[in-house]
Amino acid sequence: CPVNWVGYEGSCYWFSRSGKPWPEAEKYCQLENAHLVVVGSWEEQKFIQHHVGPVNSWIGLTDQSGPWKWVDGTDYESGFKNWRPEQPDDWYGHGLGGGEDCAHFTEDGGWNDDICQRPYRWVCETQR
């Protein structure tokens, strides 16, 4: 893996220490020839969780085009999911207009949908 990236199975991962909105985080990953992390299994979930710690971190899952989609085209419907109880809820109560369209790790690792403009940390993934 490149310097400052961590290897696991067939992928390399980079863990940010600053925050960006989801679209900017994905753009950052793309500039590194990567994408926001696509969580494909419970093992991968635990690996990322271990490195991220109890911090909100963007993952490569969004419903900004309507259906939930992983950024690399991995099928959402048949794939691994780790939503927190009651999530996703497309909450409108933030009062900023619209619901919530981007997924992130929460403090306990469970996923939540949130406003894509929140400046959360993020995780990039690329193939080895």
Partner: antibody, heavy 117, light 107 residues
């Protein structure tokens, strides 16, 4: 294939009740907000109600508040609309539709509710 | 509640014409504006979401623009299958509201 199929429409007298159902297939039902939209004969579209994926958040149009109840059973991939105290002005085709702030897609074919004595 | 208005309420056009429909919100809805097409006896079909994003499978002759309170749906070259009624809808906040519709028929 993502699909929604409504059922339960029919003729009912004013003051009566009816329960509409919407069977969903082809997607992870619990991950999506669902909606009911109606269309009176020859009229435009009117949003009726929405429910979030886990039923945490529920919203109604003022015209049906207190009379209609939206619910869902994620284990059965089903959405419901319990309609009580029906009025003539509730006569419409009722559509269920998936989605939220990014628009409603797909829609069911609709089920006709007629309120008449 | 946010009120939605559309103009014109109906229009007559020919195949190949450029058609523009406008939608106005009573207050800012940023970009949370969706467009639907409906044909008689059928369910509505999503064409454009969040003001300008083309729904998957929708022909590129359909486009949307605008933000805040004023929005436009444009059909660059009207095709026979485009004769229908078009509705705008705000999804900025509840209660969601639809415009009254614009019927596009054959001149």
């Amino acid at each position: 294939e993502v699909q929604l199929v409504e059922s339960g429409g029919g003729l009912v007298k004013p003051g009566g009740s009816l329960r509409l159902s919407c069977a969903a297939s082809g997607f992870t039902f619990s991950s999506y907000s669902m909606n009911w939209v109606r269309q009176a004969p020859g009229k435009g579209l009117e949003w009726v109600s929405s429910i979030s994926g886990s039923s945490s958040y529920i919203y109604y149009a003022d015209s049906v508040k207190g009379r209609f109840t939206i619910s869902r059973d994620n284990a059965k991939n089903s959405l419901y609309l319990q309609m009580n105290s029906l009025r003539a002005e509730d006569t419409a085709v009722y559509f269920c539709a998936r989605g939220g702030s990014r628009g409603f897609d797909p829609w069911g074919q609709g089920t006709l509710v007629t309120v008449s004595s | 509640d946010i009120q939605m208005t559309q103009s014109p309420s109906s229009l007559s056009a020919s195949v190949g014409d450029r058609v523009t429909i406008t939608c106005r919100a009573s207050q800012s809805i940023t970009s949370y504006l969706n467009w639907y097409q409906q044909k008689p006896g059928k369910a509505p079909k999503l064409l454009i979401y969040t003001a300008s994003s083309l729904q998957s499978g929708v022909p590129s002759r359909f486009s949307g623009s605008g933000s805040g309170t004023d929005f436009t749906l444009t059909i660059s070259s009207l095709q026979p299958e485009d004769f229908a009624t078009y509705y705008c809808q705000q999804s900025h906040s509840f209660p969601f509201t639809f415009g009254p519709g614009t019927k596009v028929d054959i001149k």
